[in-house]
Each structure stands twice: as structure tokens, then as C-alpha cells.
């Protein structure tokens, strides 16, 4: 499973210090370049959950692989979904957090709920403020059950969820009706693809048994463990206040892990850190109880002792979950929990154990997959321990899996599981790119998709003329920089391609594609000047300019003119394609522009040094902007938009434009014509119920006039501000909790 | 699309019983409160009784109560009116109703109505 | 219980015209009411719930207003399709009652 963490601070005596911090442990996280892993992503999801709106939440990358949401200046901002995605590519996941209110009417007695396919599942919501009202439950925001208050047992509402898959799982909650549904009990329900102790297409493979509350991952069958715990099987434990798969993270603050909750990728949802309970997590463990949510009973023997946050501590002579081998037993000692190797390559593996009698070659054994078991070839004997040392055969992908160290001696056997994943080595899938080229360089990006593994850790590029049979140039590179290949011929083909290398012995994939690549011809040297130029109409300009008289034949094949629109922040380009012009018609221009005016000569894909620039301004056209644009929602699909004339008009009004955008929406905008320009309103419809619009709208006369003013409107729908119950539609039935 | 169909009218003496039956398609029966409401000839609309989806809550009319009895079935989509003691008031329409998916906001789906004649 | 009384009785309207049916609760049901409208051998119709919130394909011209004890249902501009009896029900409480009916004539 990919190591991403979302920690929220629950110390919620004053809301703005509450924060939100999402960790990946990640190679290479957050590094924000498309071939080398996304940003992490940290944002409240508003999809079913929506609080009013306030100021926005502040974001804070610390470094490469942290981010931190701030802002929060009241209670009700703090309650909804929470989620942090990171990982690259297949490896993409997403972390969810769900918060709810410490004052709400209902509260979760478990927030998180992982269950397995087929299972029953129960999410119980405690009556903290009473109401003789129905309780409604909802299911990722729509309808899905209804109690009656009288329902109640022992305090509580009970949604029993039989036979659950995979489909069922998300938010549920619970509502008293007519309440704010801030004050809601809010769930998260996430249902494994598999029975229970299963994964895999077809559920056809075992987990390996995930120790300390782990959660065995339906689709890759590795165990998500608990904050706090570390391993194949989640069986080491971190040292106190530390997390993440590796134990690399530690708590912030000086009271370690107390008052966060953790959230890990699916299966394994949200819990407290090792040795801390309770609803906000500032509960230690009772004796005798350790782990996550002090879900684990330590049941030491043999005079161990619970630790809360690793369990049983055992004395010396002793060893195992419970205190319970003896040290007499032979025991596998400091194994890895994860292995790994490039493709094709034949790694040694080393197995220490220790015992009494002592371990020696022939008593440890090596066990791959398949089920084939290999001997070692030679053994380092210690005072304490023997390290036995295994040749593998050639590895293949089949080998990837849990690979078994076995020691048997008189006094008993051990066995220590371990991951061996087999990674191939990456393969260019496309050539690599040209960013710019010149008489004697090319500028290329190496950064291509590859099939096989990451990360890159060496990126070679190998270059020779084309058709030529000499030796490959090769040049190291890093991985996320641009690489300018020097001292090449003007106007000659080069032959590019990009060979990638990961980690590890072996780690050296194929050569990618060959690209063909040409150098550019010589530079052009000249700098024209502007000999003038002049309006011809709103959106027409005339323009001259001259070039320096030099002996010899001219280098260049046209001329570039430039206009630069400082105010919109827009650059036009006008190619003239005959190096004999001297002047050139500009049309299509914006009317009352102040445009900045250059000419360049260019000689291939080249260009030569631009004129000193010019600064003209078109005359304005168009009628002024329409005035006191106003926006009113009528219905979950209409809103009525109401103006006055422009002022001072030069001649009558052909009709206005509107331009109708969602509010953050990212898709182009809609215009719409008012053919009656009498009219001071209009209604727009046909608009999606719930959803925020921005309209601006201006006028025509010959040409279109200045735009008025931006507002915004939402359509009605299911909103806090309702006092009664939402709307039944379809938008009703599967509704938001506004 | 959600329907509703009501069996089990018909005549029969005062004080004596029938069992009114609504066979529920289209959506998810086990989830939604249920409701009987009656029209007796030329008179306006009566509610008659309402159970919640677990089938452990009823509520019913003060005219009916003790002689009607509100019962579901949700493996069967059914739900079911028992009526014993039966009144010449009794006489009506009787429709089977799901309420809105938001639980206490009206009654959204109706069925068509079977008729009670209570008459000797 | 809560009664529920409707006015007027009988309400006779032009196709065109605006028809404005009140009805009154004997006590305060917030804005938990809804409208129904039924036509004999139908089965009934819900319009309005919440007090103002239109149902699902119910047309614009009917709209409701009102919260408290004081609801009122009106119908912008009456068509032919639109006669029949209004009932207006509150659902604050149990049980829940309907009031006694508007009917509406074509004029």
C-alpha cells in the first residue's frame, strides 16, 4: 500500500488550532513533475458534507512530502470529509478523513467501520442531545433509512447493514429530522473486496495474517498497518510517538501521539496512534490493553510485561507475541519485512538465527513462492548467531511474493515471512523530446512514460549522427532536468534516444525509441528598426520597417511582428514569409488596445534580434457596459437576471450578450442573446439545481460593447438556509446534507 | 419507477375482518415508512396508519386504533392492513402510500385504492 | 390533535385566472404541510411539501407559501386540467390530519 498518512489534531478547545496534515512516505512524493509523482493533494471534500461557507482553509507544503490545512475559525468548518491523495500513477490513493462535531445531537460510537464482503455490518449513533424526532439515515448523502425516536436502544440508533459489498461502503449518517446537519453522526463504512482473510481477483488467495488490528489489502493482499506498527505483518512496533510504514514519521509536539487520529489508505480507515483512545484520542490505554484505539490485549506470560504501545515486553530467556517461546526455541533474528530485486538478476539473500543448540548451515532453509526450497550455500557462524547466505536462481516476476526463512533445530522451529518484490527494470515507451535547438546545440527533456518500475534513478541519453556507425555519445543525467547537448554540426541529423536505470543491481532497462533530431541553421544577425506605422480602422494597422544595409546575401527567410496587449496579458504573432517585405497590414485587432509593436528577422526556426519596440493605441468601438447587473434564483433551474441601459449610447441597442459559467468550473463559457433590447431582464433556465453561477453580460451596436460587472447566484436546492425539507427530485432521493 | 397495488377489498358485514395487502416495486421497500389513508364516499381524505421501515414503530388514527392493525413484510415488499370489528364508517377507498425519501415530508407515491363496503 | 380547516369550500375559477386556496392550522405545524390534489378515480397527487417546496414534475404555476398556521396554495393561471380537490395535510405530528378539502371548479 502506498505510505500516506493524514493526521487531524482533534484538541478542539479552539478551532483555529486544529490542522490537518497529510504525510507520504513516498519516494520521491509530492514532487509535483507529471513523470516523477503528483503533489500531494490536502482538501476538505465537499461532495456530501457542505458547511457554509467562510474564509478559505490556508495550505502549507513543508518540503516534498508534507502538507498542512490551516484556517479554521469556527467549529462548524471543522465538521465533513477530509481527504489527502497521493502516489503516482496506479499507485494514486486516496486517505479520507471524516470529522464530526463534539457538540452534534448524534455522535458516532465508531467513526471507522472496515467490514468484509458479505459481512453484517453495524454503525451505532449515540444520542448526546435528545430530539423526539426521526432519526434519518443517509448513505453518501442521498435517503436511506428512517427511525423512529422511540427506536432507540440503550441511547442509541442502530443501522444494521446485512451482507454488505463492496458497493455499499462511504459516508453514512445520522440525522434527527429538522436539525442542522452539522449535528449529524457521521460514518465511514468501507467494505474489503474480499471475505474475510482473502484477496485477489476472485478472492482465490490467502492474507498473510496481519498482526496488531493490520488490515489485509483486497487488491494486493499486503497488510495496512496500524499507526505504530511496522513489518509484513504489522508484527514490530515503532517506538513510542513514531508512524509510517517504516517507523519514519514522528508526532509533532511534545506530548507525542496524544490528540491526533491517524488515517491510512483503505482498508484500514481512521484510528488513534498506538497506545491512545477515546473519541478525541487523549484517552492512554487501561492496563493490560495496547496498540491502535487500545484495541489489543497484551495477555503477557512468563512475567512479561504491557507496554501500550508495543505490548508485551518480555524478560530475558523469553520471546515471542505473548512472552510465550522460549529463548532456548530457535528464533530467525533481525529479517527484513521487505525485499527488493531487479528482474533477471541473481541476488544473495542472508538469514541470521540464534538458539541452543545453536543454528547451523544444513538447519536453515529458504522458501520461495512456488513452494521450491533452496539450501544455502555457505554460513557465517557468530558467538551469537549463524547467517546463513542463499544464491537465488535468475529471478522472475513469478517470484514476487512472501518468501519464508525457516531455521529447525532440536529445540523447536521458527519461521520469519518477508515480501520479495521483483521490479523490472524501465523501458522509454516514447523518444524523448526537443525543446529547443540552435546552429551547434539541441535542448532535449528526457522525461518520458516508461513501462517497468520506478523510480529513475539515472536517466543516460545516447546520441550520434545520423546514418553514422561510430560510437554512441552517451550523457548521465538527472532524472528531472533538461540536458543541452554541446558542440554538435549546424544543419546536421542527430539520433537521440534515452536509456532509464531504477535502484538496484540490474537495474538497467533497454534503450528507449531513437528520435531524429536537427540542428539549426546559422542565426540571423541583423535588427531591424520601425520606420512607422498608422491606424487604418478600430481593428486595422498599417506597419513599415527597414533593415541595416550589409555586404553579401541576406540570412533570413521572413520577418515576425509581435504585438504585446499588456492588459489582457495576450501576445498576437504575424508571420511575413518574404525577406524582400517592408511592410505588413495587421488586422483583427482589439479596438482601444494599447498594443507594444517588434519585428524580428527569422532564418529557419531561428530568430534574430527584435526591433526596439513600439507603442500604439487603437481607438475604442462598442457601446458602454450594461449597469447594476443582478442576479435572483427563481427555482433549482432558473435564475432571472435583471440590468439598466448603458449610458450615454452612440447609437441604438442590437441586442445584449450573456455569459453564463459555473462558479470554478474549468469548461467554456455559454453566451446567450437578449434579441429584444428593450428588455432590462431576462431568465435564464435549464441551469443544474445546487450549483453556483457567474453571468456577465454587455451589449451590441456595430460591435460588441464593454462587459459589465461579474455576479454570482446559485440555483436553489437542498441549502443550510432551508428551513424545511429538501426538494424531492431526483436531486432530493440521492440529495446532498446541506 | 415506484409502484403501488392494493388487494384485499371488498364486502363484508360490520364487525366482521379483512385484510388489506400493497405489493411495493420499484424501489427499495425495506427502506421507506409506509402508510394506509382512506376516502370514504363523498368525504375528504382520512390517514388511516403509518409504520416505519423496521416494522417496529406504528402510529394510528384515534378512529381506528385497537381494531386496525399496520404490518410489513420486507422480504415480500408487502405491506398489510389488518382490519377487524369492522364499522359501516369503515366503508372508503383505502390507498397504500410510501412517504418522501426525506421521511416526514408528505406522502409522495400513492396507489390507485381498493375498496371496503362494510354493509349487512 | 392538530385540526386542519381549509377555505373556501368550493373555489370556482376562469382558465387564466389566479385561484388562492388557504388553509389553517390549530396550532403551529412550522413548515411541515403539504398540498395534494385529487381527482375522482385517482389516485391523489402530491404538489407541495414543506410548504413551498414543489414536487417532482409538478408545473410552475402552483406554488405555496406560508409557515406557522397560515398556508396558502396558489395557481397562477388556472387551466382546464388543474379542477378537481386540494387538500392540504400537516405531518408535524401524529396523527397526521388533512384538512377538509377546496374544491376546484372550472368556471
Known amino acids: 500500500a502506498v505510505d500516506l498518512t493524514l493526521l487531524a489534531n482533534l484538541r478542539l478547545t479552539d478551532p483555529q488550532r486544529f490542522f490537518l496534515t497529510c504525510v507520504s512516505g513516498e519516494a520521491g512524493a509530492g514532487r509535483g513533475s507529471d513523470a516523477w509523482g503528483p503533489p500531494l493533494l490536502l482538501e476538505k471534500d465537499d461532495r456530501i458534507v457542505r458547511t457554509p461557507p467562510g474564509p478559505p482553509l490556508r495550505l502549507a507544503r513543508n518540503g516534498s512530502h508534507q502538507v498542512t490545512l490551516r484556517g479554521f475559525s469556527k467549529p462548524s468548518d471543522l465538521v465533513g470529509v477530509f481527504s489527502c491523495v497521493g502516489g503516482a500513477g496506479a499507485r494514486r490513493t486516496r486517505v479520507i478523513y471524516v470529522h464530526n462535531s463534539p457538540g452534534a445531537h448524534l455522535l458516532p460510537d465508531k467513526v471507522t467501520h472496515t467490514v468484509n464482503k458479505g459481512d453484517t455490518a453495524v454503525l451505532s449513533a449515540r444520542v448526546h442531545k435528545e430530539k423526539q424526532t426521526d432519526v434519518i439515515w443517509k448513505s453518501n448523502g442521498s435517503y436511506f433509512y428512517t427511525l423512529d425516536w422511540h427506536e432507540a436502544q440503550d441511547g442509541r440508533f442502530l443501522l444494521q447493514l446485512p451482507n454488505v459489498q463492496p458497493p455499499s461502503s462511504g459516508i453514512y449518517s445520522a440525522t434527527y429530522l429538522e436539525a442542522s446537519p452539522l449535528g449529524s453522526a457521521f460514518f465511514r463504512l468501507i467494505v474489503r473486496g474480499c471475505g474475510a482473510g482473502r484477496w485477489g481477483p476472485g478472492c482465490t488467495k490467502e492474507c498473510p495474517g496481519c498482526l496488531h488490528g493490520g488490515v489485509c489489502h483486497d487488491h494486493d493482499g499486503e497488510c495496512v498497518c496500524p499507526p505504530g506498527f511496522t513489518g509484513t505483518r504489522c508484527e514490530q512496533a515503532c517506538r513510542e510517538g513514531r508512524f509510517g510504514q517504516s517507523c519514519q514519521e514522528q508526532c509533532p509536539g511534545i506530548s507525542g501521539c496524544r490528540g491526533l487520529t491517524f488515517c491510512l489508505p483503505d482498508p484500514y480507515g481512521c484510528s488513534c496512534g498506538s497506545g491512545w483512545r477515546g473519541s478525541q484520542c487523549q484517552e492512554a490505554c487501561a492496563p493490560g490493553h495496547f496498540g491502535a484505539d487500545c484495541r489489543l490485549q497484551c495477555q503477557c506470560q512468563n512475567g512479561g510485561t504491557c507496554d501500550r504501545f508495543s505490548g508485551c515486553v518480555c524478560p530475558s530467556g523469553w520471546h515471542g507475541v505473548h512472552c510465550e517461546k522460549s529463548d532456548r526455541i530457535p528464533q530467525i533474528l533481525n529479517m527484513a519485512s521487505e525485499l527488493e530485486f531487479n528482474l533477471e538478476t541473481m541476488p544473495r539473500i542472508n538469514c541470521a538465527a540464534a538458539g541452543n543448540p545453536f543454528p547451523v548451515r544444513g538447519s536453515i532453509e529458504l522458501r520461495k513462492p512456488d513452494g521450491t526450497v533452496l539450501l544455502s550455500t555457505k554460513a557465517i557462524v557468530e558467538p551469537e548467531k549463524t547467517t546463513a547466505e542463499f544464491e537465488v536462481p535468475r529471478l522472475v516476476l513469478a517470484d514476487s511474493g512472501f518468501w519464508e526463512c525457516r531455521v529447525s533445530t532440536s529445540g523447536g522451529q521458527d519461521s520469519r515471512r518477508f515480501k520479495v518484490n521483483v521490479k523490472v527494470p524501465p523501458v522509454p515507451l516514447a523518444a524523448p523530446r526537443l525543446l529547443t535547438k540552435q546552429s551547434r546545440q539541441l535542448v532535449v527533456s528526457p522525461l518520458v512514460s516508461f513501462s517497468g518500475d520506478g523510480p529513475i534513478s539515472t536517466v543516460r541519453l545516447h546520441y550520434r549522427p545520423q546514418d553514422s556507425t561510430m560510437d554512441w555519445s552517451t550523457i548521465v543525467v538527472d532524472p528531472s532536468e533538461n540536458v543541452t547537448l554541446m558542440n554538435l554540426r549546424p544543419k546536421t541529423g542527430y539520433s537521440v534516444r534515452v536509456q532509464l536505470s531504477r535502484p538496484g543491481e540490474g537495474g538497467e532497462g533497454a534503450w528507449g525509441p531513437p528520435t531524429l533530431m536537427t540542428t539549426d541553421c546559422p542565426e540571423p544577425l541583423l535588427q531591424p528598426w520601425l520606420e512607422g506605422w498608422h491606424v487604418e480602422g478600430t481593428d486595422r494597422l498599417r506597419v513599415s520597417w527597414s533593415l541595416p544595409l550589409v555586404p553579401g546575401p541576406l540570412v533570413g527567410d521572413g520577418f515576425l511582428l509581435r504585438l504585446w496587449d499588456g492588459t489582457r496579458g495576450q501576445e498576437r504573432r504575424e508571420n511575413v514569409s518574404s525577406p524582400q517585405a517592408r511592410t505588413a497590414l495587421l488586422t483583427g485587432l482589439t479596438p482601444g488596445t494599447h498594443y507594444q509593436l517588434d519585428v524580428q528577422l527569422y532564418h529557419c526556426t531561428l530568430l534574430g534580434p527584435a526591433s526596439p519596440p513600439a507603442h500604439v493605441l487603437l481607438p475604442p468601438s462598442g457601446p458602454p457596459a450594461p449597469r447594476h447587473l443582478h442576479a435572483q434564483a427563481l427555482s433549482d433551474s432558473e435564475i432571472q437576471l435583471t440590468w439598466k441601459h448603458p449610458e450615454a449610447l452612440p447609437g441604438p441597442i442590437s441586442k445584449y450578450v450573456v455569459e453564463v459559467q459555473v462558479a470554478g468550473g474549468a469548461g467554456d463559457p455559454l453566451w446567450i442573446d437578449v434579441d429584444r433590447p428593450e428588455e432590462t431582464s431576462t431568465i435564464i433556465r435549464g441551469l443544474n439545481a445546487s450549483t453556483r453561477y457567474l453571468f456577465r453580460m454587455r451589449a451590441s451596436i456595430q460591435g460588441l460593447g464593454d462587459w459589465s460587472n461579474t455576479v454570482e447566484e446559485s440555483t436553489l436546492g437542498n441549502g443550510l438556509q432551508a428551513e424545511g425539507p429538501v426538494q424531492e427530485s431526483r436531486a432530493a432521493e440521492e440529495g446532498l446534507d446541506q | 419507477e415506484v409502484q403501488l397495488l392494493e388487494s384485499g377489498g371488498g364486502l363484508v358485514q360490520p364487525g366482521g375482518s379483512l385484510r388489506l395487502s400493497c405489493a411495493a416495486s420499484g424501489f427499495t421497500f425495506s427502506r421507506y415508512r409506509m402508510a394506509w389513508v382512506r376516502q370514504a364516499p363523498g368525504k375528504g381524505l382520512e390517514w388511516v396508519s403509518s409504520?416505519?421501515?423496521?416494522?417496529?414503530?406504528?402510529y394510528y388514527a384515534d378512529s381506528v386504533k385497537g381494531r386496525f392493525t399496520i404490518s410489513r413484510d420486507n422480504s415480500k415488499n408487502t405491506l398489510y392492513l389488518q382490519m377487524n370489528s369492522l364499522r359501516a364508517e369503515d366503508t372508503a377507498v383505502y390507498y397504500c402510500a410510501r412517504d418522501l425519501s426525506i421521511a416526514a415530508a408528505g406522502t409522495a407515491y400513492w396507489g390507485q385504492g381498493t375498496l371496503v363496503t362494510v354493509s349487512s | 390533535d392538530i385540526q386542519m380547516t381549509q377555505s373556501p369550500a368550493t373555489l370556482s375559477v376562469s382558465p387564466g385566472e389566479r385561484a388562492t386556496l388557504s388553509c389553517r392550522a390549530s396550532q403551529s405545524v412550522s413548515s411541515n404541510l403539504a398540498w395534494y390534489q385529487h381527482k375522482p378515480g385517482q389516485a391523489p397527487r402530491l404538489l407541495i411539501y414543506?410548504?413551498?417546496i414543489r414536487a417532482t414534475g409538478i408545473p410552475a404555476r402552483f406554488s405555496g407559501s406560508g409557515s406557522g398556521t397560515e398556508f396558502t396554495l396558489t395557481i397562477s393561471s388556472l387551466q382546464s386540467e388543474d379542477f378537481g380537490v386540494y387538500y392540504c395535510q400537516q405531518y408535524k405530528d401524529w396523527p397526521r390530519t388533512f384538512g377538509q378539502g377546496t374544491k376546484v371548479e372550472i368556471k
Open positions: 409504520i416505519y421501515p423496521s416494522g417496529g414503530v406504528t
Open positions: 414543506g410548504a413551498s
